[in-house]
């Protein structure tokens, strides 16, 4: 007789979850010499330790300390790129321009990028078929636990001027309640923060709104303000020729707006 | 060129309360934190906390909760740290430190002496 | 909190020789690989002078004879070669974690 099992509204675990979190862990090592030294093996057993056996809606930060304490690597603090629903373009950006880095360039980011993973309270099992929404049901989930401790821990690693990307084809541009908006934002020191400049990128073609005025860039910027940090903004006209003029900043039509 | 210029010594009695003024020049007062530093005679360097010049909410370190006060005149560009019921170990020189530490006003002596 | 302790209390170095202070931390002061400790020199009289700031960066118009390394707790102020005009106490700070503590200071002396 199949045991009962508790159904979530979100979905469940990635199929392959622990062979993908391998895998990914080898091939970063392998990409980046300086995290040589680290033992996927090690890795993979702290990331399954963090919410194997736990019920999927009591994870905590502690439970992802093992790992956290596994994933410590380098990052200069003045090259950090946060973002908020524009993924794709931040990643085309930082693989661009090398010296910058997103949190999935990191590699406990690069190992949780578009996963998603929970267990179940007192087995060892892995839970394919659902796992929690946050919304809907419950936020201390294994998934949204660990993107809060280290988007918080990147945050909170961050000075001088900190960059973020910001969707400006969304109707809230900033949101309060992405992850930037409600973990990064909050966790910049103003001790070791200067500025943070937000690329608000457009998607129409034909855009030439100045979009640093939208309302909601502007709540982004008084709560900055609020935070003792400087605040600036940019409109990015044309991603494409952003891209294209960050891999060739010499090409002569570089020199007016994107 | 950015500045930071405190108020003169001052000579007080136990008991007494004592506020000293910060005024900054040379960039945005409300842009940057402001902090408090406190140095006995022949002693170290102590962080009292800090006070945020744009909303003027003030973070104290543990031994300096209490008695000291962090407050802003913004239209001045001025940052203030006001100490009362002085008592004899607040014998000091107090230094305020923009954000970053790389500018510092001179120092104000407070002396509490009977 | 974090506490920072500064090595040796004092020390007497000859003109044009090299001066090396410590600063132990009692938990690193790093978070991914960026050590947030500043090293100050403060002269009678005067306020505290920036000299280093995230362990290793020198100060804008700071003489290049000032140096520092060191990551996570174990930190070091090389001053080399010493001049005279380098004579005043050595301090170093955490800025990682509130509350921002100083080590007790580091007295250099010509010998």
């Known amino acids: 007789v199949p045991r009962w099992r508790q159904q979530w509204s979100g979905p469940g675990t990635t199929k392959r979850f622990p062979e993908t979190v391998l895998a990914r862990c080898v091939k970063y090592t392998e990409i980046h010499p300086e995290m040589r030294h680290v033992d996927c093996q090690s890795v993979w057993d702290a990331f399954k330790g963090a919410f194997i056996s736990k019920h999927p809606c009591n994870i905590t930060e502690e439970d992802y300390q093992p790992l956290m304490k596994l994933g410590t690597q380098t990052v200069p603090c003045n090259k950090i790129l946060l973002w908020s629903r524009i993924k794709d373009l931040a990643h085309q950006f930082t693989q661009v321009q090398r010296d910058m880095f997103t949190l999935e360039d990191t590699l406990l980011g690069y190992l949780a990028d578009d996963l998603t993973w929970c267990g179940e309270f007192n087995t060892s099992k892995i839970n394919y078929q659902s796992c929690p929404d946050w919304r809907k049901d419950c936020s201390n989930n294994p998934v949204s636990v660990f993107w809060k401790t280290v988007s918080r821990r990147f945050a909170e690693a961050a000075c001088d001027v900190v960059h973020v990307m910001l969707n400006g084809s969304r109707s809230k541009i900033f949101d309060k309640n992405s992850t930037f908006g409600s973990v990064e934002v909050h966790n910049l020191q103003p001790e070791k923060v200067q500025t943070l400049e937000a690329w608000v990128i457009h998607g129409g073609r034909e855009d030439s709104r100045d979009l640093c005025q939208d309302p909601t860039i502007k709540e982004l910027e008084s709560i900055i303000s609020k935070r003792n940090i400087q605040f600036s903004c940019k409109n990015i006209y044309r991603p494409d020729k952003f891209l294209q003029c960050v891999k060739n900043p010499e090409d002569s039509s570089c020199t007016s707006e994107i | 060129q950015i500045q930071l210029v405190q108020s003169g010594p001052e000579l007080k009695k136990p008991g007494e309360t004592v506020k000293i003024s910060c005024k900054a020049s040379g960039y945005t007062f409300t842009n940057s934190g402001m902090n408090w530093v406190k140095q006995a005679p022949g002693k170290g360097l102590k962080w009292m906390g800090w006070?945020?010049?744009?909303?003027?909410?003030?973070t104290y370190a543990d031994d300096f909760k209490g008695r000291f006060a962090f407050s802003l005149e913004t239209s001045a560009s001025s940052a203030y740290l006001q100490i009362s019921n002085l008592k004899n170990e607040d014998t000091a020189t107090y230094f305020c430190?923009?954000?970053?530490?790389?500018?510092w006003g001179q120092g104000t002596l407070v002396t509490v002496s009977a | 909190d974090i506490v920072l302790t500064q090595s040796p209390a004092s020390l007497a170095v000859s003109l044009g020789q090299r001066a090396t202070i410590s600063c132990r931390a009692s938990e690193s002061v790093a978070i991914y690989g960026n050590s947030f400790l500043k090293w100050f020199q403060q002269k009678p009289g005067q306020p505290p002078k920036l000299l280093i700031y995230?362990?290793?960066n020198l100060e804008s118009g700071i003489p290049a004879r000032f140096s520092g390394s060191g990551s996570g707790t174990d930190f070091t102020l090389t001053i080399n070669p010493v001049e005279a005009d380098d004579v005043a106490t050595y301090y170093c700070q955490q800025i990682n974690e509130d509350p921002y503590t100083f080590g007790g200071g580091t007295k250099l002396e010509i010998k």
């Open positions: 995230r362990a290793s």
């Open positions: 006070i945020n010049t744009y909303t003027g909410e003030p």
């Open positions: 430190a923009r954000r970053g530490f790389v500018y």
